[in-house]
Every structure is written in C-alpha cells, then in structure tokens.
C-alpha cells in the first residue's frame, strides 16, 4: 500500500524539514531558512514564530519544528502557546487598568498573575479559622468549635504573623 | 467558520453612556483576545481597548483610560464596550475584532456599529 | 506609545508596484500588520506578523519590516486593490496602535 501510495503521490516521501517542490518536478526540497514542516508529504513549510516585543526565544525554529516563545521578565504567558504576554504583578496584588492594585481587605492572591480571590469562608463549612488570612494567603480552616472539646486532641492556633492585609480602593 | 455580530446603530445625548455589544460564533471565545476599534467619520482606525475573556483583565490606549470599560460574558460568547461622558467626537463607526491566536493580526472583524452622539 | 506614521496617499498605475511604508521608532523590534479597508466595509487582514499572508489573500501582496521601517509591497496592482491601508503594530501585549492610514489610488 505505501509504495501505491508513492506511485501515486511522490510527496508523500518527503520527510518533515522539506516540501514537494512543484517548480522543481515534486523533488522533495529542504525548508528555507525561517521556515519549518513538521510533518512528512507538505507541499509549502511555514514561517517560523519570531519573539519580538515582549516576547522571548524559548526554543529556536529548526526545519521541523517552530519556534517557541515566553515572556520577558516582568511578564507571564497567557493563552495556548504563550499567545500574549501579561505584566506581572506582586503577590497580595492584582492588575487592574491603572496597573498593579493590593488586594482588598477580605481577598488574597497567592501569585504574580491573576486576581485577588476571597478568602475562603471556614463557618460554612462548620470549621473555625486557624490561620488568619493575608493579601497573600487564604485563611487557614481548622476544626469546628465543637471538636475542640475538653479530651480532643486540639491544635492551637499560631498567632497571625501580622494584621490581615488591607487596603482601600 | 468565526463570525463577530455587533448590536445595532445608536444614537445618544452628549453625557450620557452607550454599550455595545458583539457576539462571537463558531470559535474558541474565552482565549482570543477581543479588542475594540472605533472610526469617525472619514477617519483612521483608533484601537481603545482589549480584553481576553478566559483571563478577564482588559487593557485600554491611553486616551481612553477611565471613560472606556470592556467586559466579556463567556457564559454567551459576547464581549461588551461601553463609552461614557460622551460627546459629538464620540461620534463614530466602532468595531469589534478578533486576535489570531498566536499572532498580532486582527482577522475577524464585527460588521461594526455607528454610534452618533447628538444633542 | 509607539507612534506610527503613514503617507496620506499614493498613486500607482495598473499593473505597476505600490510600495506603502509606516515607520515608527524602532518599529522592528515589533510585529507589523496590515489592513485594507474598502468605503463602507470593515478592515481586512492582508498580512500579519511583518510579512506573513492570510489565506485567501492574493500573493501579489508582502510585507516587510525593519530598523523603523515596516513596507506594504502590492506588486502587478489591480482596480480592486484601490482602497484605504492601515499598519497597525503589536508588542506582545494586550495593547496595539494603528497609523493614520494610506488611500492607495490606482491610476
């Protein structure tokens, strides 16, 4: 079936990192420079992915494969294949219009992308806080009042490293 | 095959607010980012704003900053642009455009939306 | 902000080149696209990322960009590509810029 095939369809023995070149009677031709097949059979290789801007060289274009790009630093990735490049913001803050915002009172962010989220509500779930939260940190939920009976083993609670973080908007 | 639809042709008093609305079919909504371009009459294109709904920040040009918001609702596809404080240079045809996902190419545009602002 | 700067117009005869330039400090350090824009119509993409091409768009049209200088080439022009063109340029960010725009009038 495959050497049918190839009677058939000469491009189908040209390999990734070439094209079928109907200029030259469907020999198989490397790629040119800047550009890439990642598959066997094509008749036209791609133009490789350039970093510019913002963007950086993760991995180089090769003649089978594209480029790859990240972000600066100071930057993060967004979307499939790093499509867009996103400033980024310290923990305890989220990117708003007018740029890097705390997070407020009630919320927190654990990373550098992303939105202050609020911290999570430990009474409905019948536990108690543990830990205080911060900008930075969901509260820490431990058990309920009620577990912490007189014979129960109890864990007390550390005292918050500092105040919960607050900030007016 | 992608199609952007925009809400229909407004007309508005200076100082009030207007929001239009475009709604994506027959593509991936949430990780495309979605900007909005606005054209006076006889004039150039002028890019206000972005947003990408799966992430929800939006970004906006300079000029825009405090008087424009884009939201997105991922729930139906559809991306919004409200303007407010308007006034008769607000007067103009505003289009919503889709990014190609790894490039920085707009290549699918709303049929866009004139938007007059009269007294 | 990146500011971009087309010519208001130029003139080609049937069949001849049309060379469009938008230049910008720096402007290669960025990705270029291009727009053609017909009276009443939207924008279309004819070419993306400095000098790629859009299915479906003729290969007569290319697109080059370097030092501050990104080009617009339309080689055998014909009557249809008589319209507006925009250079828009893109830093990876959710944030872009348009030039002035170029009405292209062929002779």
């Known amino acids: 079936f495959e050497r049918t095939r190839s009677l058939q369809d000469p491009c189908s023995n040209c390999p990734a990192g070439t094209f079928c070149d109907n200029n030259r009677n469907q020999i198989c031709s490397p790629c040119p420079p800047n550009s890439f097949s990642s598959a066997g059979g094509q008749r036209t290789c791609d133009i490789c992915r350039q970093c510019k801007g913002v963007f950086r060289t993760r991995k180089e274009c090769s003649s089978t494969s594209n480029a790859e790009c990240d972000c600066t630093p100071g930057f993060h990735c967004l979307g499939a294949g790093c499509s867009m490049c996103e400033q980024d913001c310290k923990q305890g803050q989220e990117l708003t219009k007018k740029g890097c915002k705390d997070c407020c009172f009630g919320t927190f962010n654990d990373q550098k992308r992303g939105i202050c989220r609020p911290w999570t509500n430990c009474s409905l779930d019948g536990k108690s806080v543990l830990v205080n939260g911060t900008k930075e940190r969901d509260v820490v939920c431990g058990p309920s009042p009620a577990d912490l009976s007189p014979g129960a083993s109890s864990v007390t609670p550390p005292a918050p490293a500092r105040e919960p973080g607050h900030s007016p908007q | 095959q992608v199609q952007l639809v925009q809400s229909g042709a407004e007309v508005k008093k200076p100082g009030s607010s207007v929001k239009v609305s475009c709604k994506a079919s027959g593509g991936t909504f949430n990780s495309y980012a979605i900007s909005w371009v606005r054209q006076a009459p006889g004039q150039g294109l002028e890019w206000m704003g972005g947003?990408?709904?799966?992430?929800?920040?939006?970004n906006y040009a300079q000029k825009f900053q405090g008087r424009v918001t884009i939201t997105a609702d991922e729930s139906t596809s559809t991306a919004y642009m409200e303007l407010s404080s308007l006034r008769s240079e607000d007067t103009a045809v505003y289009y919503c455009a889709r990014k190609n996902e790894e490039d920085g190419g707009f290549d699918h545009w709303g049929q866009g939306t004139l938007v007059t602002v009269s007294s | 902000d990146i500011e971009l700067t087309q010519p208001p117009s130029v003139s080609v005869a049937p069949g001849q080149t049309a060379r469009i330039s938008c230049s910008g400090d720096n402007l290669g350090d960025y990705y270029a696209s291009w727009y053609q824009q017909k009276p009443g119509q939207a924008p279309v993409l004819v070419i993306y990322d400095d000098s790629n091409r859009p299915s479906g768009i003729p290969e007569r049209f290319s697109g080059s960009n370097s030092g501050n200088t990104a080009t617009l080439t339309i080689s055998g022009t014909q009557a249809e590509d008589e319209a507006d063109y925009y250079c828009q340029t893109w830093d990876g960010t959710l944030h872009f810029v348009f030039g002035g725009g170029t009405k292209l009038t062929v002779l």
């Open positions: 947003i990408i709904p799966g992430f929800g920040t939006a």
